[in-house]
């Protein structure tokens, strides 16, 4: 079986703070799964991208957000199977010829995703066909199921592209999280912060912002680049000593409605300890089962 | 083109119960769900409910949760809605819409009489 | 359940003039993840089918006259035709889709 969570290429070890992220080689991030949605049953045709991350060779995990239908109305509705592409072992968005592409064969968003306050904010796609795992596509662990998620201060990474398209406009951009700098995949490192202190930031903001427990949140306090560079659904890893592996711990979920990298503006993740009996649950097919690998 | 197509206007007597259609085409039916719409005669518009075709989920106003009963049929493309235990309080023109109320059907009319 | 309310419940206006009508919800429409307002603005003419004008609050749907115009955010909303034509009689609802649906007791437009 292939190993989680272990890249081919080590992770450089990053003791300082990142500012406006950069440039992952190939090869860095190899679970880094590019989701492109074209829904052509929407009045005029959308298109929106979003990361995810593989868990096995049939299975993505992202964001149920970037796999939600864009609609008018606030009702949850997954995008149909064959509106969505998956592209892996990519580094460039411009060249997509050493990447492997996918379609889907099945869309799962978690059933009480809530559109109001993003709460269970995580998806699954299962792979038409089994991908080919290599140097450059290899999955990611799972963490252990509890409800602590990581730790304050633990450091974590997460890399995104950000297609920047001059065509799409502010509120797409912002719907699909698609705020980066490259079409190289970046990435950043980011500290987790204390569920107390995210909360507190964003219960002072106007609006309906709820940090719940199936969150976490992770930035720095001053500011900075460092939070725009995530693509929504993109796993935030951790690694974990004990194991030697890289473990999704969280899927980039939102922000505030600020600039990103404003003061006290904290990224929002998918808490995934939160969920893996159900992600197990959904990819309990015996190929799935099989191929899934958790952190133990 | 899409169009919805409704069933005829229905004349009921009190106490009985009715299945009105909305035929779908010219757009994949189960990728978008299906609203139905009361309007009682000069009077304004109120939604009773939608359902979902790719997975029969469904979801009420809950005025209308013991009086509508929404079905699909994904093999004719064809939503329906059941009206039960019908009172002169159900005399309307009830809409079927679809593609995020892009496309409406042409109504029925059903009226309730002894 | 949400309650919106329209203003006012009827007017008539010569063509050519500008008339604006609003709509009041009891709370709050604008989803602050999507960054959109739940709110739709429908016409309605006699013996005819609703038609769908704006969505999102301000989003005019594909081949809408640019005559209507959709504004407002939070609570209140409001629709304004610049320039009013014969063809505009109809009855206008707006609903929001925040939560569920709901519909607004509509504005019925005259023309004098």
């Known amino acids: 079986l292939p190993v989680c969570g272990q890249p081919s290429r080590a992770l450089p070890n990053l003791v300082k703070r990142i500012i406006g992220g950069r440039n992952a080689e190939l090869g860095l991030f190899p679970w880094q799964a590019l989701i492109v949605v074209e829904d052509t049953s929407r009045i005029p045709n959308d298109k929106w991208f979003g990361s995810g991350a593989l868990l096995s060779e049939s299975w993505i995990l992202t964001a149920a957000h970037v796999l939600r239908s864009q609609r008018r109305d606030n009702t949850v509705i997954p995008v149909s199977k064959d509106h969505v592409t998956v592209y892996l072992g990519l580094h460039d968005v411009r060249d997509k010829s050493g990447a492997v592409n996918s379609s889907a064969a099945r869309v799962v968003l978690h059933p009480d995703f809530n559109i109001q306050n993003y709460n269970h904010d995580i998806a699954l796609v299962q792979l038409q066909e089994p991908v080919p795992l290599g140097a450059h596509v290899m999955p990611i662990c799972l963490p252990r199921p509890e409800p602590e998620g990581p730790a304050p201060h633990m450091l974590g990474l997460v890399a995104g592209w950000g297609i920047s398209n001059p065509n799409v406009t502010v509120d797409e951009i912002i719907i699909s999280g698609t705020r980066t700098l490259s079409d190289v995949l970046q990435y950043v490192k980011l500290p987790v912060v204390s569920h107390a202190e995210c909360k507190a930031s964003y219960e002072s903001r106007s609006g309906n912002y709820s940090v719940t427990e199936n969150m976490f949140c992770a930035g720095y306090y001053e500011g900075g680049k460092d939070t725009c560079l995530g693509d929504s659904g993109g796993a935030f890893v951790i690694f974990d000593e004990m194991s030697q592996r890289w473990v999704a711990q969280g899927l980039v979920s939102w922000g505030g409605p600020e600039e990103c990298g404003s003061k006290q503006v904290y990224g929002v993740y998918t808490k995934v300890s939160n969920y893996v009996d159900w992600l197990l649950e959904e990819m309990n097919s015996p190929r799935g089962v099989r191929e899934l690998q958790v952190e133990r | 083109q899409v169009q919805l197509k409704q069933s005829g206007p229905e004349l009921v007597k009190p106490g009985a119960s009715v299945k009105l259609s909305c035929k779908a085409s010219?757009?994949?039916?189960?990728?978008?769900?299906i609203n139905w719409v009361k309007q009682r005669p000069g009077q304004g518009l109120e939604w009773i409910g939608w359902?979902?075709?790719?997975?029969?989920?469904?979801k009420y106003n809950d005025k209308f949760k013991d009086k509508a009963t929404l079905t699909v049929d994904t093999s004719s493309n064809t939503a329906y809605m059941d009206l039960h235990s019908l009172t002169s309080e159900d005399s309307a023109v009830y809409f079927c819409?679809?593609?995020?109320?892009?496309?409406w059907g042409q109504g029925t009319l059903v009226a309730v009489s002894s | 359940d949400i309650v919106m309310t329209q203003s006012p419940s009827s007017l008539a206006v010569s063509a050519g003039e500008k008339v604006t009508m609003t709509c009041k919800s009891s709370?709050?429409?604008?989803?602050?993840?999507?960054?959109?307002?739940?709110l739709a603005w429908y016409q309605q003419k006699p013996g005819q089918s609703p038609k769908l004008l704006i969505y999102?609050?301000?989003t005019r749907e594909s081949g809408v006259p640019d005559r209507f115009t959709g504004s407002g955010s939070g609570t209140d909303f409001s629709l304004t035709i610049s320039s009013v034509q014969a063809e505009d009689l109809a009855v206008y609802y707006c609903?929001?889709?925040?939560?569920?649906?709901?519909f607004g007791g509509g504005t019925k437009l005259e023309i004098k």
């Open positions: 819409s679809s593609l995020e109320d892009t496309y």
């Open positions: 010219g757009y994949t039916f189960t990728t978008d769900d």
């Open positions: 359902i979902y075709p790719r997975d029969d989920r469904t």
């Open positions: 709370q709050s429409l604008l989803n602050s993840r999507t960054r959109k307002n739940y």
């Open positions: 999102w609050a301000s």
């Open positions: 609903k929001q889709s925040y939560n569920l649906y709901t």
